[in-house]
């Protein structure tokens, strides 16, 4: 058993049929010695008396809020949560496996630049009685500070018969140099509590590997005389690291109709303009990627050919 | 400890081309190592990230773009002095700080060159003959060093009398290649910045 936060404890259980469970001793936080009784949740049934209560925790029915009282007055609470371990593996029932970039990916993180700011998100089908707490650091043995905000519900989607909820959190490394060469990864730890179930999820990454620039901005077209070609120009996104001559981007320019199966014109360039062939009912799209370290491409920025 | 904005004439920076070749060569070599040594811990997640130039050179700090010198987190107290005569400087106006940056890059290359050559000598003794260093990568390191053209004491190639542990050597190769790729990215960014200035 260990303390998650004040008055909230996590009991780690090997989860299999007829498991013996864990013996837990609760102590009432009071100077009083006599006349103390214990109850669980809303029940008035007295579970025991005395300053300590010993319980055998085997299942979710044994978890919950234990309260010690004296003469009708509440003295203190202890909330017991269960953390299940099945076949030596901690349970991952609360969050959905996003399977990208690999199986067992529950947390996904992205950074728009090298400032040390990043966003992580996760998915669940659970809609109520759900709380998250996020901590982060650079390295684990001698951790350096990363400050994370509160996790918030950022999107709801319908997937077949199910609703899916996306939560996200923003974090900022306390003293980040955009030009630094990372040797210790960022560690992100998410505590998830659903009713009386506790789970934790972790992710470890270098900012350089989770870079995904915002799409290029201010796309403009200029038709070329006596030709089917148009010159398309754009600018670096505002959120990208500066100076741009140091943090350079490379771009992919594509002309395509509405269907992915349609024919297309595609060209890669390090410049902020390109000449392509425009077709009726097609769009010109441009996306960006770090020129020197190939992490993710940005989403497309698009303008219609016409 | 930072680069001035007024540097060589645009497009006249001979090291940019070499630094692009360097990044390409080390990236290819790393990809080859990851494929060939697929049953060894050779991915970014699996290896320890070591920097053989730590406390010996200060490339990131010495080559910091002017715009980042206002960022407290980028200013490190480490100071290293180097010999300052380089042909990549391409202009008499080039400041001492830029010479410091380029000589720091030169020292990095020299250290990696020695490590890679020592390692290759060991890998050539491996009866499995599983992986060797790409001669193109070693040539590209050499070309960039020549373009930088700094006078510097030659570092003797390390020789070891004991029987090489090929497993450890291959893991060290992965660690070195990962670190060198990160440094090659920094070098490319620096050369691009200098070329644009």
């Amino acid at each position: 058993i260990w303390e998650l936060k004040k008055d909230v404890y996590v009991v780690e259980l090997d989860w299999y049929p007829d498991a013996p469970g864990e013996m837990v001793v609760l102590t009432c936080d009071t100077p009083e010695e006599d006349g103390i009784t214990w109850t669980l949740d809303q029940s008035s049934e007295v579970l025991g008396s005395g300053k300590t209560l010993t319980i055998q925790v085997k299942e979710f029915g044994d978890a919950g809020q234990y309260t010690c009282h004296k003469g009708g007055e509440v003295l203190s609470h202890s909330l017991l949560l269960l953390h299940k371990k099945e076949d030596g593996i901690w349970s991952t029932d609360i969050l959905k496996d996003q399977k990208e970039p690999k199986n067992k990916t529950f947390l996904r993180c992205e950074a728009k630049n090298y400032s040390g700011r990043f966003t992580c998100w996760w998915l669940t089908t659970i809609s109520t009685d759900l709380t998250f707490s996020v901590k982060s650091s650079r390295g684990s043995s001698d951790p350096q500070g990363v400050t994370c905000g509160a996790a918030t519900l950022s999107a709801e989607r319908v997937r077949g018969d199910n609703k899916e909820y996306e939560y996200s959190v923003e974090c900022q490394e306390d003293s980040a140099c955009p030009a630094a060469e990372e040797s210790l990864p960022i560690e992100v730890m998410v505590d998830a509590v659903h009713k009386l179930k506790y789970e934790n999820y972790t992710s470890s990454f270098f900012i350089r590997d989770i870079i995904k620039p915002d799409p290029p901005k201010n796309l403009q077209l200029k038709p070329l005389k006596n030709s089917r070609q148009v010159e398309v120009s754009w600018e670096y996104p505002d959120t990208w690291s500066t100076p741009h001559s140091y943090f350079s981007l490379t771009f992919c320019v594509q002309v395509q109709g509405k269907s992915k199966r349609e024919k297309k014109d595609r060209v890669f360039t390090d410049k902020t303009s390109a000449t392509v062939i425009c077709r009726k009912n097609a769009s010109i799209s441009v996306r960006a990627q770090d020129r020197y370290y190939s992490s993710s491409w940005s989403e497309w920025a698009s303008v219609p050919c016409s | 400890r930072n680069l001035p904005v007024a540097t060589p004439d645009p497009g006249m920076f001979p090291c940019l081309h070499h630094s692009q070749n360097l990044l390409r060569a080390v990236s290819n070599m790393l990809q080859k190592a990851r494929q060939t040594l697929e049953f060894y811990p050779c991915t970014s997640e699996e290896i320890d990230h070591e920097d053989i130039t730590k406390d010996k050179t200060s490339t990131v700090e010495a080559c910091l773009p002017l715009e980042l010198t206002k960022n407290e987190s980028c200013l490190n107290s480490r100071e290293t002095s180097f010999i300052t005569n380089g042909s990549c400087l391409a202009s008499r106006k080039t400041s001492f700080m830029m010479a410091l940056c380029l000589s720091s890059i030169y020292e990095d290359l020299k250290m990696y060159q020695v490590e890679f050559k020592t390692m290759n000598a060991k890998l050539l003794m491996d009866p499995k003959r599983q992986i060797f260093l790409d001669q193109n990568m070693l040539a590209v390191i050499d070309e960039l060093m020549q373009a930088l053209n700094f006078n510097s004491e030659t570092v003797p190639q390390k020789s070891s009398l004991e029987e090489p542990d090929f497993y450890k050597t291959k893991i060290k190769l992965c660690i070195l290649l990962h670190a060198f790729r990160i440094r090659a990215v920094t070098i490319d960014r620096v050369m691009s910045y200098l070329n644009a200035s």
Partner: antibody
Framework: QVQLVQSGAEVKKPGSSVKVSCKAS????????LHWVRQAPGQGQEWMGW????????EYAPKFQGRVTITADESTSTAYMELSSLRSEDTAVYYC???????????WGQGTLVTVSS | DIVMTQSPLSLPVTPGEPASISCRAS??????LHWYQQKPGQAPRLLIA???QSISGVPSRFSGSGSGTDFTLTISSLQPEDFATYLC?????????FGQGTKVEIK
């Protein structure tokens, strides 16, 4: 299986014209750009131009502008390349090639040898 | 027009050995470079698109690298069927242009 089948070899006199055909099978004809590329004996490949069979849009290499005409007939899934004012240096194997991507070629015809000789 | 220069023009290689062919552009073309294989009396066959993207059906021994002006096609271990002429082609701008070809011959 996508295939491009070209017309047979031609022998032409200088100053005359030649029209080479390229019939496509497999896939929808108008879903691809169609190019013409030539290779003179002992020389490298030379790109001549492309057509979008969907709308008839064409673009030609400046070297051939005014001398080459590329057309397409959607009803027969056939593209044509006509080269006029032939000279001996136009002796080459002419290839048609196609792709959904405009700027490179994933399927080629077998080639048509055009010999220009007096 | 962008001029594409291949080297060497002829490359004698022992079967089973690796081979590298170089292609240089007269100006920077990013990764807009494609590689083809051509055998005598046959049409070219696409091997690599955009400098390094493999093409389905092409053996994994063929790989490409490079960007800007310098590109390389590598054949990790030459098989008897790989002896042919290899062409590079730029797609950075029109007119599309090809290298003059590198003939890989049996040593």
């Amino acid at each position: 299986q996508v295939q491009l089948v070209q017309s047979g070899a031609e022998v032409k006199k200088p100053g005359s014209s030649v029209k080479v055909s390229c019939k496509a099978s497999g896939g929808t004809f108008s879903d691809y750009y169609l190019h013409w590329v030539r290779q003179a004996p002992g020389q490298g490949q030379e790109w001549m131009g492309w057509i979008d069979p969907e709308n008839g849009d064409t673009e030609y290499a400046p070297k051939f502008q005014g001398r080459v005409t590329i057309t397409a007939d959607e009803s027969t899934s056939t593209a044509y390349m006509e080269l006029s004012s032939l000279r001996s240096e136009d002796t080459a194997v002419y290839y048609c090639a196609r792709n959904k991507e405009l700027r490179y070629f994933d399927v080629w015809g077998q080639g048509t040898l055009v010999t220009v000789s007096s | 027009d962008i001029v594409m220069t291949q080297s060497p023009l002829s490359l004698p290689v022992t079967p089973g050995e690796p081979a590298s062919i170089s292609c240089r552009a007269s100006q920077s073309i990013s990764i807009n470079l494609h590689w083809y294989q051509q055998k005598p009396g046959q049409a070219p066959r696409l091997l690599i698109a955009f400098a390094s993207q493999s093409i389905s059906g092409v053996p994994s021994r063929f790989s490409g690298s490079g960007s800007g002006t310098d590109f390389t096609l590598t054949i990790s271990s030459l098989q008897p069927e790989d002896f042919a002429t290899y062409l590079c082609q730029q797609s950075n701008s029109f007119p599309l242009t090809f290298g003059q070809g590198t003939k890989v011959e049996i040593k």
